[in-house]
């Protein structure tokens, strides 16, 4: 299971698609900017065994997939780009699930670092709450799109650290 290689490629494709999804100029939404307090420490590969890194990455992508699979999201984005982006996320989820089965050493270690998983979930709860408070406005979605690009970049960095561990 060459997780770091396949996942980084998938992540890059997802980032490109998410970049293409932008509909309005970020400069017109400067007043809507918000600090979602991304849990950066959860993307520090040094503190994780590979199994736990896999589950944190999966959590990140699953929560992103959940966010972009809502009816409100469907109304906000161009459908074919949204579908391609979602398909890319789904493929990454499948790859990560398969890695748990294939990766030597994952079996012996716990998959869960509960604090890390909860930190990622709370981060996405803050994003969802922001969208609700801003009534899913175009600028709110633009701010969220930029934030998810940032979080996907962090997850790519975690991948690179994992590759160095290999």
């Amino acid at each position: 299971c060459d997780l770091p290689q396949t996942h980084s490629l998938g992540n890059r494709r997802a980032l490109i698609l998410l970049g293409q999804m932008g509909r309005i100029s970020p400069f017109s939404c400067l007043k809507d900017r918000h600090d979602f307090r991304i849990p950066q420490e959860e993307f520090d590969g040094n503190q994780f065994q590979k199994a736990q890194a896999i589950s944190v990455l999966h959590e990140m992508i699953q929560q992103t997939f959940n966010l972009f699979s809502t009816e409100d999201s469907s109304a906000a984005w161009e459908q074919s780009l949204l579908e391609k982006f979602s398909t890319e996320l789904y493929q990454q989820l499948n790859d990560l699930e398969a890695c748990v089965i294939q990766e030597v050493g994952v079996e012996e270690t716990p998959l869960m670092n509960e604090d890390s998983i909860l930190a990622v979930r709370k981060y996405f709860q803050r994003i969802t709450l922001y969208l609700i408070e801003r009534k899913y406005s175009p600028c709110a979605w633009e701010v969220v799109r930029a934030e998810i690009m940032r979080s996907l970049s962090f997850s790519t960095n975690l991948q690179k650290r994992l590759r160095r561990k290999d």
Epitope: Q62, F65, Y90, N94, A98, V106, E107, L111
Partner: antibody, heavy 126, light 110 residues
């Protein structure tokens, strides 16, 4: 909490088709798969296939390929099972089942069935 | 394709006794992807244990799961009257996604 409500019992002739529906309510996500699992009278559980409603992606068990079709609507979140060329041995209770978004970590969520419908009895009889 | 074989087929025990149910896989299964369910007559299955050993919400601590590789166990430390049912193990494999059930073990009152 997710509630899954299936359509009522059906009696079908051999060779015909049946369509069973499963409506999800509560804390539902179209980004988690909905599966169909059947149980013949006095027998064990058998996974038939699943659908990811967000994308319409399906996966079918080898045993059913060629005569099973699973579809879904996203709003209201509903999954459908269609089984064709029915045989007497298809007489069973058909359950829809889904994972839980609350399972920690989420990587385990799609590997299990946390929520089950009440079951829909399909009887194949001449 | 993975085959899960549960044993024994039937277990006759009295309330208060302990029970150990076995689930053997035809090839290695990730313990993270091994799940146990309980099913009572006329009811839908209920999630008991996931990830090999994590109890689902509301499941009493008398239920525990263990094992790895090809051999897994569900242990009930002290049987309560409401525990008598059929128990199924289930594995997940990907890609493509495949869910496999064991044939079940019936725990009945002696």
């Amino acid at each position: 909490e997710v509630q899954l409500l299936e359509s009522g019992a059906e009696v079908k002739r051999p060779g015909s088709s049946v369509r069973v529906s499963c409506r999800a309510s509560g804390d539902t996500f179209s980004s988690y798969p909905i599966s169909w699992v059947r149980q013949a009278p006095g027998q064990g559980l058998e996974w038939m296939g699943r659908i990811l409603p967000a994308l319409g992606v399906t996966n079918y068990a080898q045993n059913f390929r060629g005569r099973i079709t699973i579809t879904a609507d996203k709003s209201p979140l509903t999954a459908y099972l269609e089984l064709s060329s029915l045989r007497f041995e298809d007489t069973a209770v058909y359950y829809c089942a889904s994972p839980s978004a609350d399972i920690i970590p989420s990587i385990l969520g799609t590997t299990l069935f946390a929520f089950w419908g009440q079951g829909s009895l399909v009887t194949v009889s001449s | 394709e993975i085959v899960l074989t549960q044993s024994p087929g039937t277990l006759s025990l009295s309330p208060g006794e302990g029970a150990t149910l076995s689930c053997r896989a035809s090839q290695n299964v990730s313990r993270h992807y091994l799940t146990w369910y309980q099913q009572k007559p006329g009811q839908s299955p209920r999630l008991l244990i996931y990830g090999g050993s994590s109890r689902a919400t509301g499941v009493p601590d008398r239920f525990s799961g263990g094992g790895s590789g090809t051999d897994f166990t569900l242990t009930i430390s002290r049987l309560e009257p409401e525990d008598f049912a059929v128990f199924y193990c289930q594995s997940y494999h990907s890609p493509p996604p495949v869910y496999t059930f064991g044939q079940g073990t019936k725990v009945e009152i002696k």
